[in-house]
């Protein structure tokens, strides 16, 4: 009876995600067969989040919209470890929007999920950010410094990275 109600709950949760994520990849968390964590196929997973590299070229606003219709946001990078994971899936000759912007052009950077912007956990390329008209952040590769962040005009189409919390069923 307990197993039955658990299964019914799982099925209703899966139905919620079905519109945009017809297929989920789930792994068993820990030793308990009851707990599964899932990411949409073919998203990748790291710690408690799922990541998707969007290869369509869009402005920052539309990139965020694209993530939101999939139940995600543009990526918020919280640690060096998280960035190191993300860059494994990126192409060196491309740039990708992050969920970081400076809407007023006053160098008040803010993350899309309202995570406080912490200057100590940022990975700007040297000399960046450098232009008040460039109010959106990308991650890209520079041969001298490897992967880092750069500010760019928000209307210039780029690829992007979406992030969502893992789905627990």
């Amino acid at each position: 009876n307990f197993m039955y109600s658990k299964t019914v709950k799982r099925l209703s949760k899966l139905r919620e995600y079905q519109q945009y994520h017809p297929s989920l990849t789930c792994v068993m968390e820990g030793k308990d067969i009851e707990d599964w964590s899932c990411c949409p196929t073919p998203w990748t997973s790291f710690q408690s989040s799922c990541y998707f590299i969007s290869t369509g070229m869009q402005s920052w606003t539309k990139s965020q919209k694209n993530c939101s219709v999939m139940g995600a946001d543009l990526v918020v990078i919280n640690t060096r470890e998280e960035q190191d994971f993300i860059i494994q899936n990126l192409k060196r000759n491309s740039s990708y929007f992050l969920g970081l912007s400076d809407p007023g052009g006053r160098r008040h950077w803010q993350w899309v999920d309202q995570t406080p912007y912490n200057e100590n956990v940022t990975f700007w390329h040297s000399g960046e950010p450098n232009n008040l008209d460039e109010r959106c952040a990308i991650i890209n590769f520079r041969s001298s410094e490897e992967w880092g962040w750069n500010d760019i005009h928000c209307h210039v189409p780029q690829k992007s990275i979406c992030k969502m919390k893992k789905i627990y069923i």
Epitope: G56, Q58, V69, N131, E134, I152, H153, H155, V156, P157
Partner: antibody, heavy 118, light 107 residues
Amino acid sequence: QVQLVQSGAEVKKPGASVKVSCKASGYTFTSYIIHWVRQAPGQGLEWMGTIYPGGGDTSYNQKFKGRVTMTRDTSTSTVYMELSSLRSEDTAVYYCARMGDNEYFDYWGQGTLVTVSS
Amino acid sequence: DIQMTQSPSSLSASVGDRVTITCRASGNIHNYLAWYQQKPGKAPKLLLYDAETLAIGVPSRFSGSGSGTDYTLTISSLQPEDFATYYCQHFWSTPYTFGGGTKVEIK
């Protein structure tokens, strides 16, 4: 007032290159991105790509990749679109257009007719 | 790439007529759609953006509607200066493709 003034008509031979200019005035040149759109005689409109005059960042329509190059000169508030390896199908009016704050083309140049003929 | 299919390709109408032009996208463009008017030998002029927002200086007889993949431009009462070619364009992702155009001619 905002103005985009383009260079004059050009006649080119197949295989040659053409460079069309678009001089902006009436606004801060480096604050708005510029797009290029072309229109073959009696045909519809075709998006070619965009350039950000501040940093020089570009994004091109894959159809033209390798043949189109967009550049800018901030000292003269001018954007350039160069198309190489011209063929007769490239005969068209080439327009530059400014993308406004709302992310649509709010101002257009008057157009530059490029004729490719042997 | 998202394709834009505009219909009809041409239509004949009289002054005072109500005119409707449709544009269908091959994928969801989330209302990121513009409508332009173009007269012979001139550059296109922005009429509406975000599917239904009137551009500055555009008469209120022009209106737009739609969502997802299907969008409409309506001219409530056609005026002599409205005889022109109309284009839709999406701005969801590059390439920002245009519809094939609708030529509005005098009946």
